[in-house]
Interface confidence: medium
């Protein structure tokens, strides 16, 4: 089959890295310098990716794959294959318009990176507040005053019943 | 399990306009793109939007698209005016993880420009 197949299509034989060159008669020629195929059997080579201004070289180009990108300190990722990169912000703040802003009283971000989200709210699980929010961690919700057997409150309190949120991006 | 659903796709003259929708199934409380795929080339970057609003463009659509959300319907949206004969692409929205260590993709949605 194989055989046949590249008695039918000699570009079938061009393994990645090269281009079937129509130019002279279809064979097989390098990706030009800044280049790459990363199939076989492509009739043209595909221009590498430079990682400039706030963009930088995670992995260099080859003549079979692509450069990676990733971002100077100060800034982050977004999107697929570092699409972006986005400024950094402190943890308690979130990047707006106007840029980086502090949390709002009720919410918080543990990231450099995301959007101030709300404090847990303990009661809705029947619990109480065990250690208070700040701009930049969540609430711990521990059991309600009413699940505390007579002298609980003078052990070791129990361990929160709800890890600090992670701000999904 | 994140789910994205694109439609408005189709074929339009140039010059003209389309608005394309993602619906997206779990939570949007997070950033989204649009992207794009001309046939034979490589898919490319254009125009995300975070869930507080900021938005940013591919230089080649600036001024021609809009991108918004309706986090009410968990939607989002691109609006897109002036239309080219090089913006047919099947156009894909997506968004990433909490860590940005993996991007989930719709299955895309064609539009094509052409006379």
């Known amino acids: 089959f194989e055989r046949t197949r590249s008695l039918q299509d000699p570009c079938s034989n061009c393994p990645a890295g090269t281009f079937c060159d129509n130019n002279r008669n279809q064979i097989c020629s390098p990706c030009p310098p800044n280049s790459f195929s990363s199939a076989g059997g492509q009739r043209t080579c595909d221009i590498c990716r430079q990682c400039k201004g706030v963009f930088r070289t995670r992995k260099e180009c080859s003549s079979t794959s692509n450069a990676e990108c990733d971002c100077t300190p100060g800034f982050h990722c977004l999107g697929a294959g570092c699409s972006m990169c986005e400024q950094d912000c402190k943890q308690g703040q979130e990047l707006t318009k106007k840029g980086c802003k502090d949390c709002c009283f009720g919410t918080f971000n543990d990231q450099k990176r995301g959007i101030c989200r709300p404090w847990t709210n303990c009661s809705l699980d029947g619990k109480s507040v065990l250690v208070n929010g700040t701009k930049e961690r969540d609430v711990v919700c521990g059991p309600s005053p009413a699940d505390l057997s007579p002298g609980a409150s003078s052990v070791t309190p129990p361990a929160p019943a709800r890890e600090p949120g992670h701000s999904p991006q | 399990q994140v789910q994205l659903v694109e439609s408005g796709g189709g074929l339009v003259q140039p010059g003209g306009s389309l608005r394309l929708s993602c619906s997206a199934s779990g939570d949007i409380f997070s950033i989204m793109f649009w992207y794009r795929q001309a046939p034979g080339k490589q898919r490319e970057y254009v125009a995300h939007?975070?869930?507080?609003?900021?938005?940013n463009y591919a230089d080649s659509v600036t001024g021609r698209f809009t991108i918004s959300r309706d986090n009410s319907k968990n939607t989002l949206y691109l609006q897109m005016n002036s239309l080219r004969a090089e913006d047919t692409a099947v156009y894909y929205c997506?968004?990433?993880?909490?860590?940005?260590?993996?991007?989930?993709w719709g299955q895309g949605t064609l539009v094509t420009v052409s006379s």
């Open positions: 939007i975070t869930s507080n609003g900021r938005t």
């Open positions: 997506a968004r990433d993880d909490a860590t940005n260590t993996r991007t989930y």
